[in-house]
Amino acid sequence: IVLRPSRVHNSEENTMRALTLKDILNGTFSYKTFFPNWISGQEYLHQSADNNIVLYNIETGQSYTILSNRTMKSVNASNYGLSPDRQFVYLESDYSKLWRYSYTATYYIYDLSNGEFVRGNELPRPIQYLCWSPVGSKLAYVYQNNIYLKQRPGDPPFQITFNGRENKIFNGIPDWVYEEEMLATKYALWWSPNGKFLAYAEFNDTDIPVIAYSYYGDEQYPRTINIPYPKAGAKNPVVRIFIIDTTYPAYVGPQEVPVPAMIASSDYYFSWLTWVTDERVCLQWLKRVQNVSVLSICDFREDWQTWDCPKTQEHIEESRTGWAGGFFVSTPVFSYDAISYYKIFSDKDGYKHIHYIKDTVENAIQITSGKWEAINIFRVTQDSLFYSSNEFEEYPGRRNIYRISIGSYPPSKKCVTCHLRKERCQYYTASFSDYAKYYALVCYGPGIPISTLHDGRTDQEIKILEENKELENALKNIQLPKEEIKKLEVDEITLWYKMILPPQFDRSKKYPLLIQVYGGPCSQSVRSVFAVNWISYLASKEGMVIALVDGRGTAFQGDKLLYAVYRKLGVYEVEDQITAVRKFIEMGFIDEKRIAIWGWSYGGYVSSLALASGTGLFKCGIAVAPVSSWEYYASVYTERFMGLPTKDDNLEHYKNSTVMARAEYFRNVDYLLIHGTADDNVHFQNSAQIAKALVNAQVDFQAMWYSDQNHGLSGLSTNHLYTHMTHFLKQCFSLSD
């Protein structure tokens, strides 16, 4: 009897298996999340497993199908959108991806009142963006770079803009650089809260240099893809913001919103638009040298039918130690008085925190404080403010949801999530219904993800929305690697790391080490999240130790760490990876003759520089779609951190920080360079230049290109990529196939 548990344990161990590469490539252990599509304070829509669109009422506990899978299938719909008056649903089909967020699609409007598709005045195709007004069933859409308005789905459209032109003028949608580096959306139009006005951006790319690359396809001659793409120091898009009255669009036509004088005096960006009321709007602007941001609150003047942005309603945010904001400048969340707002920015100690601005930024009231950071404001109601932070137990890679009672004085703070499922859940996001009556919590780990529904008043859990039971069962016989998150203290710098260890890890043995690096400004790799991915397989099956390290330049640990890389990209990020590797060697279980590093995108840049650091630490490494010179990358991103590539600014460091400048140092490492030829983001040019420099230096290296693949190397290329990288690493580490 005493021995039995041991026998059971042994037999269990025998039935358990390591992860295989096939598991990873097939997505066998992928998880599901549940984000309710809120349509009121107590109702949400969700697409069921059999593709019916179901409306759930939390208070009555009832649910009913508003749109059948038959209707969805009749137009091959892959997405839907219910009009706020619940009379119509748009169905989206023929999805065709463009860039990261943008895509075109065909849209059909289904009339719920008569159970038929709307006939007459059908929408043109393909449409670049379409959305309902926040109230009723007006439609705004972008077709061929112009904006159209429909009072109702069956009505003829009203054309708002006429100057839209492919690759020249973009109305209501961003150009490449604004989509990728500023707005992070596929749209650039915004309805006012009750649908009275429609604001939109116009981007003029006429003078922007064009990146051109071949798309090989299947034809006799390759196509050439042309994208207006401003690289560092190049001419940028010219942006203008307009607002049109959607009831009387022809009355005075689109009215331009004035740019603050201190912004308009030199090159600038528009960064975001937030409606406050139907007649008050807040615009955020940023100087091209991105350390000055201006938030401008504008009011509608009925008598002149114009938008007035008084200087007294301009709020300046300036950074003296780096760039403005984190990755982006934060957006305001307005309170019920429609003039004061809550916003995250650096406090005097250099930590990003929530501030309440009533009149001026100088008089801002700090709402949160401490040596941690507030990360996102989810919702402000009459009496509560919900936000996320990494305060709990001083782990920067966690996210918990907090509620501050702003209705009472002094405001009290409560952590909503900290103790819910403490072992399983340390990284949350949330989704709130109208007036925060209810909310969903989505936990990403470190355990198996789980989504739950909660009462917004009491925080009581109402039900589990998704707990990934099938995944849990599937993992029962899998030998998953062990994970630990710890920190290193080196020269007054805290380096957090995540280590992924083989299942039967033994500290007395020696293991090959793979560093996975991203390391870009304001990024975070060491997070308490669940993942079964390629590196999980490498630890589980191939017995490697994998480490991720957040060095200088990474986020959510204060401005000192974040802004350390300002104007000096490619220096400290690399140093900190090297420092961490040395510390890992000191731990005694790393085989120092078998250390590799790999990264993608910014991580490809860092891994390349680390391999070429001349330390002799790395035996081999992989760079996937790396940046090789900051002169080749997008202006908005690059200049934020590096300034301009001009003699009187920062040209010297632009030149010093290239991978090509270190070509000679690759001689003593095995280097695998990988890139997609149709990468619209980090152009193939980057790898082409690395390869040229290595050839010119007569340095041997390995390379793989993926024809017609973009920065994501998706589809069959993904399988080929990870198989190829696995072979490379196993060869490097002398592991048998």
Partner: antibody, heavy 118, light 107 residues
Amino acid sequence: EVQLVESGGGLVQPGGSLRLSCAASGFTFRGYIMSWVRQAPGKGLEWVSWISPEGSRTGYADSVKGRFTISRDNSKNTLYLQMNSLRAEDTAVYYCARLQYGTWFDYWGQGTLVTVSS
Amino acid sequence: DIQMTQSPSSLSASVGDRVTITCRASQSISSYLNWYQQKPGKAPKLLIYAASSLQSGVPSRFSGSGSGTDFTLTISSLQPEDFATYYCQQATLLLPTFGQGTKVEIK
């Protein structure tokens, strides 16, 4: 099917009053700008007045300003035109029309004749 | 107010003819120009909106063009049912005004 049906026309003496009605059906009345357009016998079309979807904003031609009042009852899907201080030159067929986007008249009623004569 | 001037005020044409009516605004009205057809004793009917968009159900022989101040209505091949009076109309500043009309008669 969109339908607009005017009523209330007739013979009235100069200086008199008349109230025209327009019953709307076949569309979401409360969502549209509505308008009155008139046509004097043998003449062209002349816009008279418009009213916003919720009824808070109105517009009038100079020729009727201060004498005519446009209104609507969204619960009854009905548009009205109150005509006071009528003059001989107000004699016309009065059409009720939907003013799409405040820009074009996409649906018209059959019209009602108003005759101002002593 | 913006004045709309139509020309000609009347024209005679035969079935199958290509007919062109022009409309000039006293100042720029962008593309906010519409065309209507009216037959005796009937209400006007919208043909073209926003200078060039064909109203649903209107035959494709009708087309519109122009922007700014000069606009054109074209009937590519006149049909018997097309003999009527045609009006242009603008609506900037929420003050709609009509042209004086063009009567198309049988030659």
